[in-house]
């Protein structure tokens, strides 16, 4: 009786041992598979995130292109209308120029001394920008950014004068504190006779030969033949 119980116990032990080994193996397999699934999920997640990011970037890029296309189309159709009409008035701005109120503006991306910048504008039937109001100051400031940029204000001939003849004394001014100072301390000969936007939008006088960026302005209603 006792030996029979011993045999049954041994058999149960073997069965249990086999079951444990089998379970351990299954757990290991499942654990491995789980790890693989987790890794695959992570991989898929990062792929999905990347695809979403790429899509988002593509969408933004596409939107920018569409905006630019619409802007160019509007500009071209406007100029076509001018050409088809009698051409006496410019109601739109040339391509790459930005319209604001009654003027068109062109913002350079390179630098030139003040006289060369003004000459460049004149060749475009324009002049260096004349800042006439709070609103125009803010508009230009936004487009120029925190960069030194020439404006159409100079005292090379004595008093400060705007290049288009706008009265300086009664007009808008946005000089930085202590400016203009006609500083001679730079040691480059002479004082400072040309005005420019500084990084914060305030105006400063500087040597006219500095190669700063510049802003051209032309009237929208100006005769297209001139």
């Amino acid at each position: 009786q006792n030996s029979k119980l011993q045999e049954e116990l041994q058999a149960l032990r073997e069965t249990f041992s086999n079951l444990t080994a089998s379970t351990d193996a299954k757990v290991k397999t499942l654990s491995m598979q789980g790890g693989n699934v987790g890794r695959k999920m992570k991989s898929l997640e990062s792929q999905l995130e990347k695809q979403q990011q790429d899509l988002s970037e593509d969408h933004s890029s596409l939107l920018l292109h569409v905006k630019q296309f619409v802007s160019d189309l509007r500009s071209l159709s406007c100029q076509m209308a001018v050409l088809q009409g009698n051409g006496s008035e410019r109601t739109c701005c040339p391509v790459n120029w930005v319209g604001y109120e009654g003027s068109c503006y062109w913002f350079s991306r390179s630098g030139k001394p003040w006289p060369e910048a003004e000459k460049y504008c004149q060749l475009e039937n324009a002049h260096l920008v004349v800042v006439g109001s709070w609103e125009e100051q803010k508009f230009i400031q936004h487009h120029v950014g925190p960069v030194n940029s020439w404006i159409g204000l100079t005292d090379q001939s004595g008093p400060w004068k705007w290049v288009d003849g706008t009265d300086y004394e009664s007009g808008f001014k946005n000089w930085r504190p202590e400016q203009p100072d006609d500083w001679y301390g730079h040691g480059l000969g002479g004082g400072e006779d040309c005005a420019h936007f500084t990084e914060d939008g305030g105006w400063n006088d500087d040597i006219c030969q500095r190669p700063y960026r510049w802003v051209c302005e032309t009237q929208r209603d100006r005769d297209s033949g001139s």
Epitope: W134, E135, Q137, K138, F139, H142, F172, K173, N174, W175, P177, E178, D200, G201
Partner: antibody
């Protein structure tokens, strides 16, 4: 520390005049534009006027144009608001504030109360 | 004149809540928008300039966004000291104009 202190408020009859002052300390007054802003009892903020650091530009709210004058004395670090032809609707707490880049107001005084009443 | 419209005019929220205040300009003001906070009996406090730049010393839970005509002030996790009135202000054009204010109250 940077400080603005308004004074000159009080009770005044309609049609009369009053001059508010704002004493600045703790910063280079002559390097900053300055504003006046007002707040009627229980109401929101209303911008009144701005003057450039050097006095070269002055702008006013339509509601005070021709009646109020903003001025400054950089040697005494003081901002002024001359108010004339006062009306009941000018009743408010008047604040002076330092300008940050054409329009922002980064430092404010504690305010002075103006009451226009007969 | 440029009109500034804030919404809502008032809201109730709890400490820890995320709060969003909208400000709309009647015309394009690019990004020339500031936000102020005012507590009862006190002068306004400058929070945010040019739509999204945080004024020095202002907690980072405050943030601003938007351009053109639509702007937002967000408080990511409302603190007890944030219960106040918030004003937007445009500086693109004179006369400078403020929104009517948004009162943030305790729920």
């Amino acid at each position: 520390q940077v400080q603005l202190v308004e004074s000159g408020g009080g009770v005044v009859q309609p049609g009369r005049s009053l001059r508010l002052s704002c004493a600045a300390s703790g910063f280079t007054f002559s390097s900053f534009g300055m504003h006046w802003v007002r707040q009627a009892p229980g109401k929101g903020l209303e911008w009144v006027a701005i003057i450039w650091h050097d006095g070269s530009n002055k702008y006013y709210a339509d509601s005070v144009k021709g009646r109020f004058t903003i001025s400054r004395d950089n040697s005494n670090n003081t901002l002024y608001l001359q108010m004339s032809s006062l009306r009941a609707e000018d009743t408010a707490v008047y604040y002076c504030a330092r300008d940050l880049s054409m329009g922002g107001m980064d430092v404010w005084g504690q305010g002075t109360t103006v009451t226009v009443s007969s | 004149d440029i009109q500034m419209t804030q919404s809502p005019s008032s809201l109730s929220a709890s400490v820890g809540d995320r709060v969003t205040i909208a400000c709309r300009a009647s015309q394009n003001i690019i990004s020339y928008l500031n936000w102020y906070q005012q507590k009862p009996g006190k002068a306004p406090k400058f929070l945010i300039y040019t739509a999204s730049s945080l004024q020095s010393g202002v907690p980072s839970r405050f943030s601003g966004s938007g351009s053109g005509t639509d702007f937002t002030l967000t408080i990511s996790s409302l603190q007890p000291e944030d219960f106040a009135i918030y004003y937007c202000q445009q500086t693109y054009s004179t006369p400078l104009t403020f929104g009517g204010g948004t009162k943030v109250e305790i729920k």
